[in-house]
Amino acid sequence: GQGTPSLVPHEEAAAPGRTTATPAGASLEWSQARGLLFSPAPQPRRLLPGPQENSVQSSACGRQHLEPTGTIDMRGPGQADCAVAIGRPLGEVVTLRVLESSLNCSAGDMLLLWGRLTWRKMCRKLLDMTFSSKTNTLVVRQRCGRPGGGVLLRYGSQLAPETFYRECDMQLFGPWGEIVSPSLSPATSNAGGCRLFINVAPHARIAIHALATNMGAGTEGANASYILIRDTHSLRTTAFHGQQVLYWESESSQAEMEFSEGFLKAQASLRGQYWTLQSWVPEMQDPQSWKGKEGT
């Protein structure tokens, strides 16, 4: 095994305290060149320290990687449970290739892949295996009981062969940032609603605090005005109707907000922040921890 896991080409992809927002179809580089689409909010007081605040990380574990390509060495991280997150703009997919693997499948070692349309456990026949995510984000979690064991991964990204995103969908990465709902425009008028995806470091949870205004009276049918927030891991979904201050916490590091077509047509607005909380249990830490987490 390796004493010091490495990440190529950059040690830390997402700078602490920075949010990257990209609309569907926009490249990450394009959005950064223009500056942040959502200006960073004052950092809210956290209940617990965020996982991305350490200036030096000696392990690959716990990181969020936003580069187009990279190598992630999860061999010998010194912990049985190691997770990394990979994030790309909407409209791209993540490809993963296992360069080396010393997982002991019969001892319960495994690799877990997690995303909006991906819930995969794998161990056997990993070497040289190439996996392509269905969406732009992927959490890779390794469970390895043997010191020095683990996998060496190479990841890349490419344009999705087809996309299930709408023009008005947005993606947020990073440990905290500002949330602003989309407004009615040609891109949103026939979209059937717009979504905002939030992905943070893999051992973190997401807290959202926001004010919803001008929500309108429609609660049923095609013109219903509502906001849905869904935890990508547990699939727990919460609906918010009417003008209110909303607070929501995820169970995992991935969340999806949906603004209904009625919300957009009512010219409703949501403004607020999200930030990270320390996870009480690492998502997918143990396969048995998946028990009871399915269903909504």
Partner: antibody
């Protein structure tokens, strides 16, 4: 290639039991969730039950909850559906189906067995 | 339980026609919608997952679109082997539910 071969269907009286089996090959069985879906004669499709790769999570349709039990034996690459207290309305063609993911909550079915007919009648 | 409603329930068309089948969910299901094709005496076959993603091996004349509550399956140019029954299915929450089916017949 992926194959799902089903067995265990037949004619049974109301109130009795039946066990369906599904033998899988052509893929790493214990990497994937599995489901049972049924189709009453001349009718549409109805999801019956799903089970995660390690049996850690299981779900049932309300219509069969408490009467049917889904299980799997990863060592034998097999999926089972134990059906107790059968009713006339359980009469259907039962399909086993593979999920493209490991957790049954993925909820899609990329490969299907050939189906096995269960007829509940006195 | 989420209700899925397909329309039309049956449809007559000719080879070469462009055909659209719609599916409506009783509440928003984001893009968690799948389409299946079933021929008489056969098991269903997955065509489209996640509303618009083409399953491997499925001809490109099949396409899916939509999100939220309204979805469509389009066959750009009908082939003789496409005459079958088509089902939509939501994978947003359990219990997973299917539409009642659309039977596509030769005119």
């Amino acid at each position: 290639q992926v194959q799902l071969v089903q067995s265990g269907g037949g004619l049974v009286q109301p109130g009795r039991s039946l066990r369906l089996s599904c033998a899988a090959s052509g893929f790493i069985f214990d990497d994937y969730a599995m489901h049972w879906v049924r189709q009453a004669p001349g009718k549409g499709l109805e999801w019956v039950s799903g089970i995660s790769w390690n049996s850690g999570s299981i779900g049932y349709a309300d219509s069969v909850k408490g009467r049917f039990t889904i299980s799997r034996d990863n060592a034998k690459n097999s999926l089972y559906l134990q059906m107790n207290s059968l009713r006339a309305e359980d009469t259907a063609l039962y399909y086993c189906a593979k999920d493209p993911n490991s957790l049954y909550r993925s909820g899609s079915f990329d490969y299907w067995g050939q189906g096995t007919l269960v007829t509940v009648s006195s | 339980e989420l209700q899925m409603t397909q329309s039309p329930s049956s449809l007559s068309a000719s080879v070469g026609d462009r055909v659209t089948i719609t599916c409506r969910a009783s509440q928003s299901i984001s893009s968690y919608l799948n389409w299946y094709q079933q021929k008489p005496g056969k098991a269903p076959k997955l065509l489209i997952y996640a509303a618009s993603s083409l399953q491997s091996g499925v001809p490109s004349r099949f396409s899916g679109s939509g999100s939220g509550t309204d979805f469509t399956l389009t066959i750009s140019s009908l082939q003789p082997e496409d005459f079958a029954t088509y089902y939509c299915q939501q994978s947003y929450s359990t219990p997973y539910t299917f539409g009642q089916g659309t039977k596509l017949e030769i005119k």
